[in-house]
């Protein structure tokens, strides 16, 4: 039994890191393998992660971690019984994939303005709380070409757009994702989408 693709890990910079790797053949990850991990820290203890299958030869492990700080470094040991298959380390702050924003809501009761709001996925004491920027994706269910991205580079988790920038009388969907420039993170997954019917009063044409 050998490791074909070494474990690669990403952290949500809060409490979970996800590690994925591939074996050289079909493997029952949960019965045959164990991933041991430990924070390099005077007050830490070793933890064991039981991996799940991720395709025939692929394995994935969700590591429960202490709240992350930038200096954290974890040792990783992949075992098959008594055999050490791979040994490595992982700095969560260098491989961050933020959590997806939640509670996306479209407020249509403001006169001719759409207000989209969502929740920051981090608590206020987390470093990323004040460092997230967002991308909002809005698209028409009727017209695949009607697809747009709004970059929200300020900290407030909201976006205001004129209803008239979208077509009236049809349904739209929106979703939002986050990233943090400070740690050069990847984008988060998209939030669940939310749907609304866009309608607004056309301005009277003057001749």
């Amino acid at each position: 039994m050998k490791v074909l693709q070494e474990p690669t890990c990403v952290s949500d910079y809060m409490s979970i890191s996800t590690c994925e790797w591939k074996m050289n053949g079909p493997t029952n990850c949960s019965t045959e393998l164990r991933l041991l991990y430990q924070l390099v820290f005077l007050l830490s203890e070793a933890h064991t992660c039981i991996p799940e299958n991720n395709g025939g030869a692929g394995c994935v492990c969700h590591l429960l971690m202490d709240d992350v700080v930038s200096a954290d470094n974890y040792t990783l040991d992949l075992w098959a019984g008594q055999q050490l298959l791979w040994k490595g380390s992982f700095k969560p702050s260098e491989h961050v994939k933020p959590r997806a924003p939640g509670n996306l809501t479209v407020h249509t009761n403001v006169s001719d303005t759409l207000l989209l709001t969502w929740s920051n996925p981090y608590p206020p004491d987390n470093y990323l709380y004040n460092h997230l920027t967002y991308a909002v994706n809005i698209w028409s269910e009727n017209d695949p070409a009607d697809f747009r991205i709004y970059n929200v580079t300020y900290l407030e988790p909201s976006l205001r757009i004129a209803a008239s920038t979208l077509k009236s009388g049809i349904s739209y969907r929106a979703r939002v994702r986050a990233w943090a420039q400070c740690y050069n993170t990847t984008w988060s997954e998209w939030s669940p989408s939310t749907k609304w019917h866009n309608s607004y009063r056309e301005p009277f044409e003057q001749h």
Partner: antibody
């Protein structure tokens, strides 16, 4: 908002015991290492003890064998059991959250060891 | 055990002046594990700098940290009235734990 509130300080005779408590709120207590740091009157800061999320502990040489740190994650509380107290243990005792450094501190509780 | 020595013991300056505080370690300290704190009379310490040079949330940019190995510096570019306080450096070591310097008092001249 992160808050740490110490209690349990007071006047105790040399050789006596005292138990300090720290009530934590505003963060996930169970995922953070916690510490006691003290400051004798007019003096500098001294790390006393720390406890990891899994219960691993460490102590300064000056208190080893006399003080015991513990935590109750269900109650979001940190404790310091202080036995065989000496005059030189007189200090303000601060509860702190952290790891390699201490990012949040309580306001402290004064322990006076005197006959 | 790593010993941290801060200098000077007291720094007498006027508001608007630049303050330079030194922290010297008896052995090399990882930049990741060096922090600075501010403490005012009757108050708890407040984290200013971690990782030798990263400002803690809410700390004004007039505070900056630098250095590596055994020599570290906290600089306050222009002293404000609220900056007069005692400043401590602190290090963490995987075997010995946490130690503080003895402090530098920044007082009004």
């Amino acid at each position: 908002e992160v808050q740490l509130v110490e209690s349990g300080g007071g006047l105790v005779q040399p050789g006596g015991s005292l138990r300090l408590s720290c009530a934590a709120s505003g963060f996930t207590f169970s995922r953070n290492a916690m510490f006691w740091v003290r400051q004798a009157p007019g003096k500098g800061l001294e790390w006393v003890s720390g406890i990891g999320t899994g219960g691993a502990t460490s102590y300064a040489d000056s208190v080893k064998g006399r003080f015991t740190i513990s935590r109750d994650n269900a109650k979001n509380s940190l404790y310091l059991q202080m036995n065989s107290l000496r005059a030189e243990d007189t200090a303000v005792y601060y509860c702190a959250r952290g790891r390699y450094y201490f990012d949040y501190w309580g306001q402290g509780t004064l322990v006076t060891v005197s006959s | 055990e790593i010993v941290l020595t801060q200098s000077p013991g007291t720094l007498s300056l006027s508001p608007g002046e630049r303050a330079t505080l030194s922290c010297r370690a008896s052995q090399s300290v990882s930049n990741s594990y060096l922090a600075w704190y501010q403490q005012k009379p009757g108050q708890a310490p407040r984290l200013l700098i971690f990782g030798a040079s990263s400002r803690a949330p809410g700390i004004p940019d007039r505070f900056s940290g630098s250095g590596s190995g055994t020599d570290f510096t906290l600089t306050i570019s222009r002293l404000e009235p609220e900056d007069f306080a005692v400043y401590y450096c602190q290090q963490y070591d995987h075997s010995a734990g946490w130690t503080f310097g003895q402090g530098t008092k920044v007082e009004i001249k």
